[in-house]
Amino acid sequence: FERTRSLQDPCSNCPAGTFCDNNRNQICSPCPPNSFSSAGGQRTCDICRQCKGVFRTRKECSSTSNAECDCTPGFHCLGAGCSMCEQDCKQGQELTKKGCKDCCFGTFNDQKRGICRPWTNCSLDGKSVLVNGTKERDVVCGPSPADLSPGASSVTPPAPAREPGHSPQ
């Protein structure tokens, strides 16, 4: 099939980085500046992506591949191919419509992105809290209360309810 197609369509012989130039009897011409073609047989080259504003160039556009962008410091990538940049927050915070907000009591976020998540409920696994949770860190569960030596005690807080207004946006 490939051989048949190339006999019928000279454009199929044009490699990536070129286009099939109709103005020149379908000769394969190199893509012009600021453009690329990632596959063979293309009749036009695609315009290179420009990493502007909050986007930063990770790799410039070549003749066969589009430019790759990431985000400037203080932002992180979202979406396929870093199609969006979202503001970073501090650990112990989450991004809402009103900006970065501290995690409510009983929730934590150990990253600069994403939402605050509830602390692990140790009692669901029959365990006790060994280290209390913070806004930045989950609780650390320890042995079950029955395994503790006499006189030792632990506190297992109730599973928190998320406060209204702090849900992920």
């Epitope: 190199p30 500046p33 003749s63």
Partner: antibody
Framework: QEQLQESGPGLVKPSQTLSLTCTVS??????????WSWIRQHPGKGLEWIGY???????YYNPSLERRVAISLDTSKNQFSLNLNSVTVADTAVYYC???????????WGQGTLVTVSS | SYVLTQPPSVSVAPGQTARMTCGGD??????VHWYQQKAGQAPVLVVY???DRPSGIPDRFSGSNSGNTATLTISRVAAGDEADYYC???????????FGGGTKLTVL
């Protein structure tokens, strides 16, 4: 495949204007958005980019030369030209014309022409 | 403006591997092209887009690019490879073409 050929006087007097023309064959100079460039090489030295022009007539020049240089297009003749004024002996060099394609790649090049500045 | 730095000379025995470097600030994000220029001739493209070869260039020629250094490697060097080699980028910030100073490859 495009071919490029430089032409112009091989000898220029100091303080005069150096004028070179590049003739493009095998393709149209005003199609596809290519950039058309001049590059020079002083005897025994490295390559020095002079500037380029593209089909809209917009041009970019090496900052060290931009006060003295002008590149122009003549699409009717499929040519582009270099004018470098107020030349001195330091402008003696081989001058190349070339095409710039995707990612700034320079391909093809002309064969080059030696221009000597001397009285 | 953007600056590319190349060592003035590299020497290698026939059959050995020659490596020529091209230094530039964060050059790894840029696209690097390499040209070979033999005495009295126009430059010829030998590697483009960091590591691609034009048709007709032997696979002994290869390129790499990361961090602050791009490298042109010629394996199984032959006497005919003796030439000057130039790296080149397009500085998108200024829209200027930038050449390195060139490296003279001597085959011992």
């Amino acid at each position: 495949q495009e071919q490029l050929q430089e032409s112009g006087p091989g000898l220029v007097k100091p303080s005069q204007t150096l004028s070179l023309t590049c003739t493009v064959s095998g393709g149209s100079i005003n199609s596809q958005g290519y950039y058309w460039s001049w590059i020079r090489q002083h005897p025994g030295k490295g390559l020095e980019w002079i500037g380029y022009i593209y089909d809209s007539g917009s041009a970019y020049y090496n900052p060290s030369l931009e006060r003295r240089v002008a590149i122009s297009l003549d699409t009717s003749k499929n040519q582009f030209s270099l004018n470098l004024n107020s030349v001195t002996v330091a402008d003696t060099a081989v001058y190349y014309c070339a095409r710039i394609v995707a990612a700034g790649r320079i391909d093809p090049w002309g064969q080059g022409t030696l221009v000597t500045v001397s009285s | 403006s953007y600056v590319l730095t190349q060592p003035p000379s590299v020497s290698v025995a026939p059959g050995q591997t020659a490596r020529m470097t091209c230094g530039g600030d964060n050059i790894g994000i840029k696209i690097v092209h390499w040209y070979q220029q033999k005495a009295g001739q126009a430059p010829v493209l030998v590697v483009y887009d960091d590591n691609d070869r034009p048709s007709g260039i032997p696979d002994r020629f290869s390129g790499s690019n990361s961090g602050n250094t791009a490298t042109l490697t010629i394996s199984r060097v032959a006497a005919g490879d003796e030439a000057d080699y130039y790296c080149q980028v397009w500085d998108r910030r200024s829209d200027h073409v930038v050449f390195g100073g060139g490296t003279k490859l001597t085959v011992l």
